[in-house]
Structure formats: structure tokens, C-alpha cells
Interface confidence: low
């Protein structure tokens, strides 16, 4: 079938391949201090690391990309590490009428894969 | 709001930023010559190019990533160019009982964004 099994063990060594990592950021870092009230500090999960051949392939396209990158590295980029799913986060922010709680569905990564 | 407008003009010059590009590949390139009968050659649309700050941001997470990359480039990677949608492709392939047509929904990219 077109779907080879995505590889799950990192051939580059511990912590080198595509994985979820927490980055601490303040509202000032994000440029949000003027409109977000809370939380003042966010633990942002982000996808970092490399995508060696077939590691955590998102889909058939990513597998093809990995293969063609091996054949034509100057023309076809390697797959890269991006979120596969997100965790909803609630922010309290200023509105014209006061304060509001709003859920953001696409703000913090929950899982990563190579696309 | 958390959603800044993704930027659509490429500040790096024509063809340098994240875009769809056609790569020609044979079944041999893909390692599929033993099970796919047709087409012998595929025009594969792939996402290539760079993702400068806020260019075609996929979502809020990508905008945050772009901003934090500006602040901590060694820790937070820049967003990268990946498919935003796919075009279904029909492949004719061998089966135990003969020949079958199968649609692959995630094989050829139709649009790109920075994630």
C-alpha cells in the first residue's frame, strides 16, 4: 500500500527528532499584553526537531516527500515537524464592553508529526 | 484578536516564499513500480519555499511560532511550508485478484501554508 509505517524511533539520538517541547512565553513576548489579561505567562507546547526519513510521517504525501528529498535534496525539502493536533486554551481578554473569556482551539500544540 | 492577518506578499522576492510547485516523479522514484500500474509518471504538487515572519500563517499557533522564532531563533524554529489541502489522485494498482482503482486523498498537495 502507499502507506509505509511511519518510523517512531529517532535515528539521530534522544531529543533530536520531531517532538513536543514546552516554551515559556509572556504576553509581552507575544505582543498581547495590551488585550490579553490572563494568563500572564503561557506554557506553549511547540513542535521542534528534525524529520529524518519516514520518521512520524503525517501521511502518504509526507512519505513521498521524504523519498523525493532523498533523491533530489536541492529541489524537494525534507518533511518538517508541525502540530498534528492542538489543545484548547482559554484566554481572558479585554473587550469594548469589559472582559471576556475566549477559547482558542489552534494555539497550543498537543501532538507533532512530519509533514 | 489572536489572529493577525497572515501576510501574502513575499518579502524575499518572487518564488522564494512558501508555494506549490510541481515535481515530476516516476513510479521507480517512489519505489512503487512493483505494485502501481498507472500512471507511470506522476505530477506531484509539493509545498516548497521559506516562511518569513507571518507569511501565510496557518493559524494562531503558527503566528506565535513566527514571533517566538524572532525572539528565540535558536530555541523556536521558524514556521515551515506544508500542505493546507490535498487533491485526490486515482492510482491503478495490482491486487491479489487482479487490478484495482484506488483514490488517495493525501498524496498530492493542492494548497500550502506556513505551520
Amino acid at each position: 500500500s502507499a502507506h509505509a509505517h511511519p518510523r517512531d524511533s529517532c535515528p539521530l539520538g534522544p531529543g533530536r527528532c520531531c517532538h513536543l517541547e514546552t516554551v515559556q512565553a509572556t504576553l509581552e513576548d507575544l505582543g498581547w499584553s495590551d488585550w490579553v489579561l490572563s494568563p500572564r505567562q503561557l506554557q506553549l507546547s511547540m513542535c521542534v526537531g528534525e524529520c529524518p526519513h519516514l520518521y512520524r510521517s503525517a501521511n502518504t504525501h509526507a512519505q513521498i516527500k521524504a523519498r523525493l528529498h532523498g533523491l533530489q535534496p536541492d529541489k524537494v525539502p525534507a518533511p518538517c515537524c508541525v502540530p498534528s493536533s492542538y489543545t484548547p486554551v482559554v484566554l481572558m481578554h479585554r473587550t469594548d464592553s469589559g472582559v471576556s473569556l475566549q477559547t482558542y482551539d489552534d494555539l497550543v500544540a498537543r501532538g507533532c508529526h512530519c509533514a | 484578536s489572536a489572529h493577525a492577518h497572515p501576510r501574502d506578499s513575499c518579502p524575499l522576492g518572487p518564488g522564494r516564499c512558501c508555494h506549490l510547485e510541481t515535481v515530476q516523479a516516476t513510479l521507480e522514484d517512489l519505489g512503487w513500480s512493483d505494485w502501481v500500474l498507472s500512471p507511470r509518471q506522476l505530477q506531484l504538487s509539493m509545498c516548497v519555499g521559506e516562511c518569513p515572519h507571518l507569511y501565510r500563517s496557518a493559524n494562531t499557533h503558527a503566528q506565535i511560532k513566527a514571533r517566538l522564532h524572532g525572539l528565540q531563533p535558536d530555541k523556536v524554529p521558524a514556521p515551515c511550508c506544508v500542505p493546507s489541502s490535498y487533491t485526490p489522485v486515482v492510482l491503478m494498482h495490482r491486487t491479489d485478484s487482479g487490478v484495482s482503482l484506488q483514490t488517495y486523498d493525501d498524496l498530492v498537495a493542492r494548497g500550502c501554508h506556513c505551520a
Epitope: - | R7, D8, S9, P11, G13, P52, H53, P73, A78
Partner: antibody, heavy 119, light 107 residues
């Protein structure tokens, strides 16, 4: 902290060239672009061009095309702007300014370099 | 090239006043607009990027709004240190262009 430190004031004769340097510190030089902006005495800001530190790609203002060259030296985290065939209306303060990523907004500026063109 | 037209070119105001400066682009630039403050003999300082985002360390009395072609910088309550010249800049495409500047003077 993030800093851009420019070379000192210059006095040049018409027809000569000037090369202004801009040394970056406090951040990864190759992850950012550098803009050059000038300001004639009592006038507004004029964008001259932009260079990506990581690849050396440039984009120059049309009116300066052919007279300006922007370069970077990644080994010393320094950007350079050379302006040739100087005229009296090139008298200005020249600023280098960093942009986040390769983006065009400029968040950190050098202190400026006064270039006087006079016979 | 995209032309940026700023108005007024100068404004006289008192401490505590609300000051509004406008900037108009000759074509749509989405939200790719920045505002800078410049004091005599000093380099410009970024106040607002992406039309409405406050740069880190800038007082919250500064705010930006607008999208497309029309943009506004507002200083909600003018302070003594705010007397300066303000510039808008479009970051939508090369060549980057600045507005002509607005000088905020003491009345």
C-alpha cells in the same frame, strides 16, 4: 541586550564613496534581516534597502539602484552599506535597523551615522 | 510603490490630551503597518507593529487601529515624553515606504 552599533560620522567629497558598518550583538545575526534607512536634515525617513543576513539576498530602493551595495559578514555579525558617486543630497543620517525574521518591520535601530557630502 | 499619507503634519497639544494621527495607504496593505516615534537626534523607536500590536515595553496609552488603507495611532493621554515626531510605515511589500511624519508639539 540586542544592539546595533554603527560606525562613526563621515565627511566626503561629491563623487566619492562611503561605507557604513553596523555591528549586531545580543541575537542570532543570521536569523534576521537588516534594513537601511536614511534621514536628510529636517526631513522624513527614506528606506534604502534590505538584506537577509543568512543568504545575502538584497532588495534596493529603485532610486538608489546601481549606487548602493549592501553586504553582510556573518563571521563578525556585521552589515555594511556602501553608497557610491555621492552627491550633496546624500547628506543624511544613515540608520541600520533589524527586522524580526526576514520581515520588513524594524524593531531595533542603530544609533545612526551622519554622512556629510560637501566640496 | 505604495504611498503613505500622514495627517496632520503637525499637531499642538497639552499634557493629558488625547491625540490621534492618521495614515492612509495608496492601496490596501492588510494590517502590515507600523508606527514609530522619533525624538530629535535619536533613532526611531517602534511603537506598534501589524497595525494594532503594541511593541514590548511601549506604554499602553499608545494604541493602533485600522486595516486595508486607513490607519490610526492614538495616544490616550499625552505625557511630556510623548512630544516627538511620529511616522507610519507600510510593511506589505518592497519598497518599504514611510509617511511624511507628524510632529506633536507642546501647545
Amino acid at each position: 541586550q540586542v544592539q546595533l552599533v554603527q560606525s562613526g560620522a563621515e565627511v566626503k567629497k561629491p563623487g566619492a564613496s562611503v561605507k557604513v558598518s553596523c555591528k549586531a550583538s545580543g541575537y542570532t545575526f543570521t536569523s534576521y534581516g537588516i534594513n537601511w534607512v536614511r534621514q536628510a536634515p529636517g526631513q522624513g525617513l527614506e528606506w534604502m534597502g534590505w538584506i537577509t543576513a543568512y543568504s545575502g539576498d538584497t532588495n534596493y530602493a529603485q532610486k538608489l539602484q546601481g549606487r548602493v551595495t549592501m553586504t553582510t559578514d556573518t563571521s563578525t555579525s556585521t552589515a555594511y552599506m556602501e553608497l557610491r558617486s555621492l552627491r550633496s543630497d546624500d547628506t543624511a543620517v544613515y540608520y541600520c535597523a533589524r527586522g524580526p525574521g526576514q520581515y520588513a518591520d524594524v524593531d531595533v535601530w542603530g544609533q545612526g551615522t551622519m554622512v556629510t557630502v560637501s566640496s | 510603490d505604495i504611498q503613505m499619507t500622514q495627517s496632520p503634519s503637525s499637531v499642538s497639544a497639552s499634557v493629558g490630551d488625547r491625540v490621534t494621527i492618521t495614515c492612509r495607504a495608496s492601496q490596501g496593505i492588510s494590517s502590515w503597518l507600523a508606527w514609530y516615534q522619533q525624538k530629535p537626534g535619536k533613532a526611531p523607536k517602534l511603537l506598534i507593529y501589524a497595525a494594532s500590536s503594541l511593541q514590548s515595553g511601549v506604554p499602553s496609552r499608545f494604541s493602533g487601529s485600522g486595516s486595508g488603507t486607513d490607519f490610526t495611532l492614538t495616544i490616550s493621554s499625552l505625557q511630556p515624553e510623548d512630544f516627538a515626531t511620529y511616522y507610519c510605515q507600510q510593511a506589505s511589500q518592497f519598497p518599504i515606504t514611510f509617511g511624511g511624519g507628524t510632529k506633536v508639539e507642546i501647545k
